[in-house]
């Protein structure tokens, strides 16, 4: 489809970077920013970062959240700063539902 083809000169965005792939940097530059949550042995591991090339994020960003993984993507400078990926509530599989709250 036409709208899924990468642009010749794609716009790059500054993204917050937090996680295993960030090294000592707290930001990265890419075509999309993301915020993710994965469950590792029952522990919540939150990460933020960027997809530097279009194809990298294309499939990941379209994957609906599962009980063990959720990714939310956005385009815009620092757009992932205030996004926290959330797991779906039982029986649902879309972003924006929360399985937990803080007490």
């Amino acid at each position: 489809m036409e709208d899924e083809k990468p642009k010749v000169n794609p716009k790059l965005y500054m993204c917050v970077c937090e996680g295993l792939s960030c090294g000592n940097e707290d930001h990265c530059e890419g075509q999309q920013c993301f915020s993710s949550l994965s469950i590792n042995d029952g522990f919540h591991v939150y990460q933020k970062g960027c997809f530097q090339v279009y194809e990298q994020g294309k499939m990941t960003c379209k994957t609906p959240p599962s009980p063990g993984q959720a990714v939310e993507c956005c385009q815009g400078d620092w757009c992932n700063r205030n996004i926290t990926a959330q797991l779906p509530t039982k029986g649902k599989s879309f972003p924006g539902t929360q399985n937990f709250h803080l007490e």
């Epitope: 937090e18 295993l20 949550l37 590792n40 029952g42 522990f43 937990f100 007490e103």
Partner: antibody, heavy 118, light 106 residues
Framework: EVQLVESGGGLVQPGGSLRLSCAAS????????MYWIRQAPGKGLEWISS????????YYPDSVKGRFTISRDNSKNTVYLQMNSLRAEDTAVYYC???????????WGQGTLVTVSS | DIQMTQSPSSLSASVGDRVTITCKAS??????LNWFQQKPGKAPKLLIY???SLQTGVPSRFSGSGSGTDFTLTISSLQPEDFATYYC????????FGQGTKVEIK
């Protein structure tokens, strides 16, 4: 106030079984993952199991996989640890713990002692 | 599995001393690390989460730092109630604790 109270510990022979319970109060139990951690006498801490909010996903290290089973009853605000084929090296204080999503193992129970000996 | 190596395994210090405990991970764990304090016969108590965030109710003399493989717990001015054993814990993958550091009275 968050409270976690373990029970069910005791003396058991090698090869035997035991079921530990952890009664939770002071928070919405069904919203939280729960965990068991153990500590052998005079030794360090070892994570041994986790369970998700509805009990559908469970996690174990290789040291107890196939012998221990974690489960929960959200109607009773209780998490369990069924321990089978117990060995001398399973002798430990067993702690129940809870996390919030961004603060792992924020709260712990007082522990219950399991002794495996003939 | 990721190995967590704490040092020293024990130390002697006096009230008012600045105490530093280190924890080294065998591979990159970013900031997915907590510090716990344990006193004899008691359950561990969370002090620091996500490498450097102070748990609610924990005195500000405790602080944590580090990212990747090297982490530090610092007690800026040791108090009588701080004599205990301290453990680091990583949850990046295959959750593991360090072997502990016992802080004793000099």
């Amino acid at each position: 106030e968050v409270q976690l109270v373990e029970s069910g510990g005791g003396l058991v022979q090698p090869g035997g079984s035991l079921r530990l319970s952890c009664a939770a109060s002071g928070f919405t139990f069904s919203n939280y993952y729960m965990y068991w951690i153990r500590q052998a006498p005079g030794k360090g801490l070892e994570w041994i199991s986790s369970i998700n909010t509805d009990g559908g996903s469970t996690y174990y290290p290789d040291s107890v996989k196939g012998r221990f089973t974690i489960s929960r009853d959200n109607s009773k605000n209780t998490v369990y640890l069924q321990m089978n084929s117990l060995r001398a090296e399973d002798t430990a204080v067993y702690y129940c713990a809870k996390s919030t999503p961004n603060i792992p193992l924020a709260y712990w129970g007082q522990g219950t002692l399991v002794t495996v000996s003939s | 599995d990721i190995q967590m190596t704490q040092s020293p395994s024990s130390l002697s210090a006096s009230v008012g001393d600045r105490v530093t405990i280190t924890c080294k991970a065998s591979q990159n764990i970013y900031k997915y690390l907590n510090w716990f304090q344990q006193k004899p016969g008691k359950a561990p108590k969370l002090l620091i989460y996500y490498s450097n965030s102070l748990q609610t109710g924990v005195p500000s003399r405790f602080s944590g730092s580090g990212s990747g493989t090297d982490f530090t717990l610092t007690i800026s001015s040791l108090q009588p109630e701080d004599f205990a054993t301290y453990y680091c814990f990583q949850y990046s993958s295959g959750p593991t604790f360090g072997q502990g550091t016992k802080v004793e009275i000099k």
